[in-house]
């Protein structure tokens, strides 16, 4: 029911402190819909990495993509892999590194087009979201404005939370991501609490606005874990 | 240009399957979420499936699920969706539809783009 | 699931005219509707999304407006072109939902 999705409304983890890689989301949505495969996050540092399992682009940090580990290997392992710079052969938008797009098999660079009418390699489904500018640490770079006509309104599709107008970011939306409000102060957000603590999320809202965190509102300490209701609060 | 041309629709018994392709051209096929919709004759539009970009995210309508598997080949930009235990009710025709980009002007929407769709008719 | 309820079903209308049509859903939705346009044999094609964002090549005598539960296409001025029947599509709850469709006919 819309219901159910509606209260599994849950924003990715929030990024690590300065110099860490993204967090993962949990899990993949398997063939059957409704059945959520429990994953977990990793926080990746250069001096402690480990090959992690994944189905899709979304599982990955904002600077990896989802594939098999060797050319032509078997669909079924996959790791999160290293994004691919600049001028490296591509096949979708997902493995080039931020600020470039996958076109004709390469990738380029976002600001080397005026982007008249339709662009056609655009990816809006790789589910993840990007905090771009949370607490001001930039994880992603902000792509040239010649890219755009405008700005992504609520409800359009995105890729990034650059794409999209002042107040909104880039959160799922089932198949989709689409453009979103960023939370004000009152509203209810989703903290997870340990790692792997939440499935994929189908449903997503944003994250709290500037000088607001997600915390547990104050008359429901008392409540179980499992019902606690968390808003966005200021610091 | 983008173009998305369905195929594989016809007359089958009460059952019976079918496989419905949706060739896709004029963009990077892999990049996008492709869905299903339906149109009995005479009637509205009916959402029957979506899947993600990737492959791995699946979304089926109650009335279709368990009986219709929505899948994608990238290598071929081909959609297809297979209908097995048809039923009188499912006679319509079906288009595949793709989403818009954040890249359009204006950015675009989901459902943005549809092929011309292929008939199917289930009856005995 | 959510449901969506379009009005009039059906309209006559001369060219000219303006033409309003409505979309209901059954609880809050935000902006989270596109408006397409429908002609005997043909695709839907899509007019408008998120509630008001006119598409490329869409004429601007189309507009949409509309948030929550409440939703309006308007046709400022009817051309001959415009005879077809209109739907909406809601994409904030899982299914997409769609109107039963509008049909404009010719006075």
């Known amino acids: 029911t819309l219901n159910s999705v509606l209260n599994s409304n849950a924003i990715k983890n929030l990024p690590p402190p300065l110099g860490g890689a993204a967090g993962h989301p949990g899990s993949a949505v398997s063939a059957a819909p409704g059945i959520l495969y429990p994953g977990g996050n990793k926080y990746q540092t250069i001096d402690n990495y480990q090959p992690y399992p994944c189905a899709e682009d979304e599982e990955c940090g904002t600077d990896e993509y989802c594939a098999s580990p060797t050319r032509g290997g078997d669909a079924g392992v996959q790791i999160c892999l290293a994004c691919r710079k600049r001028r490296k052969r591509c096949m979708r938008h997902a493995m080039c590194c931020p600020g470039n797009y996958c076109k004709n098999g390469i990738c380029v660079s976002s600001d080397q087009n005026n982007f008249r009418g339709e662009i056609e390699e655009t990816i809006t489904e790789s589910f993840g979201n990007d905090h771009s500018t949370l607490d001001g640490y930039s994880r992603r770079t902000t792509l040239s404005s010649k890219m755009y006509h405008s700005k992504g309104q609520e409800g359009s599709v995105c890729l990034r939370s650059s794409d999209c107008a002042t107040g909104l970011c880039c959160a799922r939306h089932f198949w989709s991501k689409i453009c979103k409000p960023v939370l004000k102060e009152g509203q209810v957000c989703t903290k997870h609490r340990r790692k792997g603590s939440h499935g994929l999320e189908i449903f997503q809202r944003c994250y709290c606005g500037e000088g607001l965190s997600c915390r547990i509102q104050k008359d429901h300490h008392q409540a179980s874990n499992s019902s606690r209701l968390h808003t966005c609060q200021r610091h | 240009q983008v173009q998305l041309v369905e195929s594989g629709g016809g007359l089958v018994q009460p059952g019976g399957s079918l496989r419905l392709s949706c060739a896709a051209s004029g963009f990077t096929f892999s990049n996008y979420g492709l869905h299903w919709v339906r149109q009995a004759p005479g009637k509205g539009l009916e959402w029957v499936s979506s899947?993600?970009?990737?492959?791995?995210?699946?979304y089926y309508a109650d009335s279709v699920k368990g009986r219709f598997t929505i899948s994608r080949d990238n290598s071929k930009n081909t959609l297809y969706l297979q209908m097995n235990s048809l039923r009188a009710e499912d006679t319509a025709v079906y288009y595949c539809a793709r989403d818009g980009s954040h890249m359009d002007k204006p950015p675009g929407y989901v459902f943005a783009f549809w092929g011309q769709g292929t008939l199917v008719t289930v009856s005995s | 699931d959510i449901q969506m309820t379009q009005s009039p079903s059906s309209l006559s209308a001369s060219v000219g005219d303006r033409v309003t049509i409505t979309c209901r859903a059954s609880q809050g939705i935000k902006n989270y509707l596109n408006w397409y346009q429908q002609k005997p044999g043909k695709a839907p094609k899509l007019l408008i999304g998120a509630a008001s964002s006119l598409q490329s090549g869409v004429p601007s005598r189309f507009s949409g407006s509309g948030s929550g539960t409440d939703f309006t296409l308007t046709i400022s001025s009817l051309q001959p072109e415009d005879f077809a029947t209109y739907y909406c599509?809601?994409?904030?709850?899982?299914?997409?939902?769609f109107g039963q469709g509008t049909k404009v006919e010719i006075k």
């Open positions: 599509l809601q994409y904030y709850g899982m299914p997409p939902t």
């Open positions: 899947i993600s970009y990737y492959g791995s995210s699946t």
